[in-house]
């Protein structure tokens, strides 16, 4: 799915007014990305509990297991983002898969992801049938990681 | 930094030809995202070795440590992506931070990220000074995770 952009003009890149109204489905088709998180969403109970499974997706087999929470905004590209939520404060023992080991912390890995928001163009509200895509950095938690606790110097 | 889009037209959203040439810096300014990976790039030696540090960024404190490798494409938004490369085949012991534990595997967590490519508009090569942004899913490894080995049923 492509987006046609005109080069030049004062705002990078700036386009001419439209002759017709774009069907909402078109924007949604273009803006919707893969609505799946990095790992398939597991609907079994263990994906939500503090234990490391021996099967299933990576987030439930991890010794720092996590679940995914959907963040949906239809004015954003991508529309759907997933935030990892750690299911344990400490890492789960590799031996048992259930008991927590206080030597390790289960912590979220954050990332500033590039996203785009559909906005009215500056100073053009209600005049033209055009819109702006505004690039922003959006903080998401990607996964939970088992780390050794930080030792302060 | 905004991108102005015209609504309507047969291609979603489609723009008129430009009157002038856009300065390269403008596209690059708009398309360049945060050039830092989820964790700050560590230039110390331990970030590249198979051990779990007690300080430093999350990727070096993890018991499934990883380094970040840059993926740069100036025709893509974001221009810079980072791929996680696992530094150990197994997880590092929480006790020692150096010896590997065969009970756990250190594996990459993959994600199909939404990216956009700058392309000539279909059937318009050499004619108009406009371009298309093509949405694609691009596979990146986000981090390395310590998991219990999968037990096949």
């Amino acid at each position: 799915v492509s987006l046609r952009i005109q080069e030049g003009c004062s705002h990078l890149p700036s386009c001419c007014p439209s002759k017709e109204q774009e069907p909402p489905e078109e924007w949604l088709k273009w803006s919707s990305a893969s609505v799946s998180p990095p790992e398939p969403l597991s609907h079994t109970h263990h994906a939500e509990s503090c234990r490391a499974s021996k099967d299933g997706p990576l987030n439930s087999r991890a010794i720092s297991p996590w679940s995914y929470e959907l963040d949906r905004d239809l004015n954003r590209v991508p529309q759907d983002l997933y935030h990892a939520r750690c299911l344990c404060p400490h890492c789960v023992s590799l031996q048992t898969g259930s008991h927590m080991d206080p030597l390790g912390n289960s912590v979220p890995l954050y990332h500033n992801q590039t996203v785009f928001y559909r906005r009215p163009c500056h100073g053009e509200e209600g005049t033209h049938r055009r819109y702006c895509l505004e690039r922003r950095l959006y903080r998401v938690s990607l996964a939970c990681v088992c780390v050794r606790p930080r030792v302060m110097a | 930094v905004s991108l102005r889009i015209q609504e309507g037209c047969s291609h979603l959203p489609s723009c008129c030809p430009s009157k002038e040439q856009e300065p390269p810096e403008e596209w690059l300014k708009w398309s360049s995202a945060s050039v830092s990976p989820p964790e700050p790039l560590s230039h110390t030696h331990h970030a590249e070795s198979c051990r779990a540090s007690k300080d430093g960024p999350l990727n070096s404190r993890a018991i499934s440590p990883w380094s970040y490798e840059l993926d740069r494409d100036l025709n893509r938004v974001p221009q810079d992506l980072y791929h996680a490369r696992c530094l150990c085949p197994h997880c590092v012991s929480l006790q020692t931070g150096s010896h590997m534990d065969p009970l756990g595997n250190s594996v990459p967590l993959y994600h199909n990220q939404t990216v956009f490519y700058r392309r000539p508009c279909h059937g318009e090569e050499g004619t108009h000074r406009r371009y298309c942004l093509e949405r694609r899913l691009y596979r990146v490894s986000l981090a390395c995770v310590c998991v219990r080995p999968r037990v096949m049923a």
């Epitope: 080069e7 | 430009s18 040439q21 856009e22 390269p24 810096e25 596209w27 690059l28 300014k29 360049s32 050039v35 490798e69 840059l70 993926d71 740069r72 494409d73 100036l74 025709n75 893509r76 810079d80 992506l81 791929h83 700058r118 392309r119 000539p120 090569e125 108009h128 000074r129 406009r130 371009y131």
Partner: antibody
Framework: QVTLKESGPTLVKPTQTLTLTCTFS??????????LGWIRQPPGKALEWLAH???????HYKPALKSRLTITKDTSKNQVVLTMTNVDPVDTATYYC?????????????????WGQGTLVTVSS | EIVLTQSPATLSASPGERVTISCSAS?????MYWYQQKPGQAPRPLIY???NLASGVPARFSGSGSGTDYTLTISSMEPEDFATYYC???????????FGQGTKLEIK
């Protein structure tokens, strides 16, 4: 107009470090999208890319030679320096520096659009 | 690392003849670039981004292709076209530039 010129020793002994300088004019390496690379060509053989440095000081190296190469830039002097450690007779080649930095309406070009004339480096004891 | 294989390695042609040089990538790539090199000279760009002619390059040169297979065509050979031709690509991860091994165009 854009010009690039390579300079450095013509003869280097095995195990020594080779230092090559590319002095350029007609463009600035601080301009977004601008980059400069080093390419070599052993006598009678093909071109081989070695290293690249971008306007924002991001550097890339040929994986097989990464441990031996270092590329740096001095924007104020309009110079890029390539150092290669532990040279061997197989490193005998003409070394070129080349610019990259063309953005067309259809996108950024990853071609080297301007080249220096090259400098022949012989590695021999 | 992606490998580029050019064929043929050497090609003999006569002025006025149509010539085609192939470049095959070991995995799919988005674009290909082409250079011409004459003895004792630095390479000069011919084709940008698969099919766009570099400045000052005669229209008898053209480029095409997609995926793994790319082609440089000279519609009617001129005496000044006898040279060595290289294909080149850029790969974003890890960021690397790769050249083909070259095709030498000789006068028949």
């Amino acid at each position: 107009q854009v010009t690039l010129k390579e300079s450095g020793p013509t003869l280097v002994k095995p195990t020594q470090t080779l230092t090559l300088t590319c002095t350029f004019s007609g463009f600035s390496l601080s301009t977004s999208g601008m980059g400069l690379g080093w390419i070599r060509q052993p006598p009678g053989k093909a071109l081989e890319w070695l290293a690249h440095i971008w306007w924002d000081d991001v550097k890339h190296y040929k994986p097989a030679l990464k441990s031996r190469l270092t590329i740096t830039k001095d924007t104020s002097k309009n110079q890029v320096v390539l150092t290669m450690t532990n040279v061997d007779p197989v490193d005998t080649a003409t070394y070129y520096c080349a610019r990259m930095g063309q953005l067309h309406y259809y996108g950024y070009d990853y071609a080297m659009d301007y080249w220096g004339q090259g400098t022949l480096v012989t590695v021999s004891s | 690392e992606i490998v580029l294989t050019q064929s043929p390695a050497t090609l003999s042609a006569s002025p006025g003849e149509r010539v085609t040089i192939s470049c095959s990538a070991s995995s799919s790539v988005s674009y290909m670039y082409w250079y011409q090199q004459k003895p004792g000279q630095a390479p000069r760009p011919l084709i940008y981004r698969t099919s766009n002619l570099a400045s000052g390059v005669p229209a008898r040169f053209s480029g095409s292709g997609s995926g793994t297979d790319y082609t440089l065509t000279i519609s009617s050979m001129e005496p000044e076209d006898f040279a060595t031709y290289y294909c080149q690509l850029y790969h974003s991860y890890p960021p690397t530039w790769t050249f083909g091994q070259g095709t030498k165009l000789e006068i028949k």
